[in-house]
């Protein structure tokens, strides 16, 4: 296993609709054809997997149908979007990139993006 540098923004504020997008950029030392991207959430020293996708270079990222993540790739950059976020989901979202094929296997883990989320104000009751 060889180390690889992964860069991501330090802080992002999600939209009022609970959507946060950020770029995860990795310094690919070679010509990888198969890449796996995993988003991990760290909150109070507990780490959980948010979503993961494996893609072939030049193709779209494919997350599971029920995933809260979507993404696109361009060269050594992955543009990740996480949807359905609520205030309780505020935390550090870490991008993990693995170059799966061809060998050698490379692993890179970013420092994390602190995503802040605020629940939208409830709409005032309207009289009909």
């Amino acid at each position: 296993c060889k180390a690889m540098h992964v860069a991501q923004p330090a802080v992002v504020l999600a939209s009022s609709r609970g959507i946060a997008s950020f770029v995860c950029e990795y310094a690919s030392p070679g010509k990888a054809t198969e890449v796996r991207v995993t988003v991990l959430r760290q909150a109070d020293s507990q780490v959980t997997e948010v979503c993961a996708a494996t893609y072939m270079m030049g193709n779209e990222l494919t997350f599971l149908d029920d995933s809260i993540c979507t993404g696109t790739s361009s060269g050594n950059q992955v543009n990740l979007t996480i949807q359905g976020l609520r205030a309780m989901d505020t935390g550090l979202y870490i991008c993990k990139v693995e170059l799966m094929y061809p060998p050698p296997y490379y692993l890179g883990i970013g420092n994390g993006t602190q995503i802040y989320v605020i629940d939208p104000e409830p709409c005032p009751d309207s009289d009909f």
């Epitope: 923004p9 330090a10 802080v11 992002v12 504020l13 999600a14 939209s15 009022s16 997008s21 950020f22 909150a43 109070d44 205030a87 505020t90 550090l92 994390g112 602190q114 802040y116 989320v117 605020i118």
Partner: antibody, heavy 117, light 107 residues
Framework: QVQLVQSGAEVKKPGASVKVSCKAS????????ISWVRQAPGQGLECMGW????????NYAQKFQGRVTMTTDTSTSTAYMELRSLRSDDTAVYYC??????????WGQGTLVAVSS | EIVLTQSPDFQSVTPKEKVTITCRAS??????LHWYQQKPDQSPKLLIK???QSISGVPSRFSGSGSGTDFTLTINSLEAEDAAAYYC?????????FGPGTKVDIK
């Protein structure tokens, strides 16, 4: 090294608006947020809200909602805070601060805004 | 919004004495609590992050502890240059909030 340099002191009349700037250097501007914190004479720190320089999204404290606008110009790594309908109790030192995962790690030197008729 | 309360409001201390400032949150904030020092006519400065993590360049006499709702800033062996206001701040949930501050002066 990281630096946040703010615009100079302002004297305004009640009802007017003020726009304070905060120029960042020494880091990738879009990787962090900028918060605006004010301090009235002899008082504590009050967070007015912040802007994510990465995407321009804003979160304003309820007290200032509708009266404050925070923006960024990523081409010049500058953040702005505009406060409208100024009142005498808006007289304060206004600070910009870099929003990191761990609180506000760098602060500007402060801008005094005096509101007086 | 999360409300932070600090005690005491004011403390007058002799040099070399130990100072303890407490900060209580209205709900659990994990370890997302940070401490700032503000000397007269200066900008605030980050002192401790995540309740207990030290900041490069900050003297080792400053330390923090706590998690959940109760936090403490300790200054071991106070020096004259430590005369300042100290604020706690939470980044657990929006909006960000500060405690009202504790003013420390030298006897």
């Amino acid at each position: 090294q990281v630096q946040l340099v703010q615009s100079g002191a302002e004297v305004k009349k009640p009802g007017a608006s003020v726009k304070v700037s905060c120029k960042a250097s020494g880091y990738t501007f879009t990787n962090y947020g900028i918060s605006w914190v004010r301090q009235a004479p002899g008082q504590g720190l009050e967070c007015m809200g912040w802007i994510s320089a990465y995407n321009g999204n804003t979160n304003y404290a309820q007290k200032f909602q509708g009266r404050v606008t925070m923006t960024t110009d990523t081409s010049t790594s500058t953040a702005y805070m505009e406060l409208r309908s100024l009142r005498s109790d808006d007289t304060a030192v206004y600070y910009c601060a870099r929003v990191a995962a761990a609180g506000f790690d760098y602060w500007g030197q402060g801008t005094l805004v005096a509101v007086s008729s | 919004e999360i409300v932070l309360t600090q005690s005491p409001d004011f403390q007058s201390v002799t040099p070399k004495e130990k100072v303890t400032i407490t900060c209580r949150a209205s709900q659990s904030i994990g370890s997302s609590l940070h401490w700032y020092q503000q000397k007269p006519d200066q900008s605030p400065k980050l002192l401790i992050k995540y309740a207990s993590q030290s900041i490069s360049g900050v003297p080792s006499r400053f330390s923090g502890s706590g998690s959940g709702t109760d936090f403490t800033l300790t200054i071991n062996s106070l020096e004259a240059e430590d005369a300042a206001a100290y604020y706690c701040h939470q980044s657990s949930s929006l909006p960000f909030t500060f405690g009202p501050g504790t003013k420390v002066d030298i006897k």
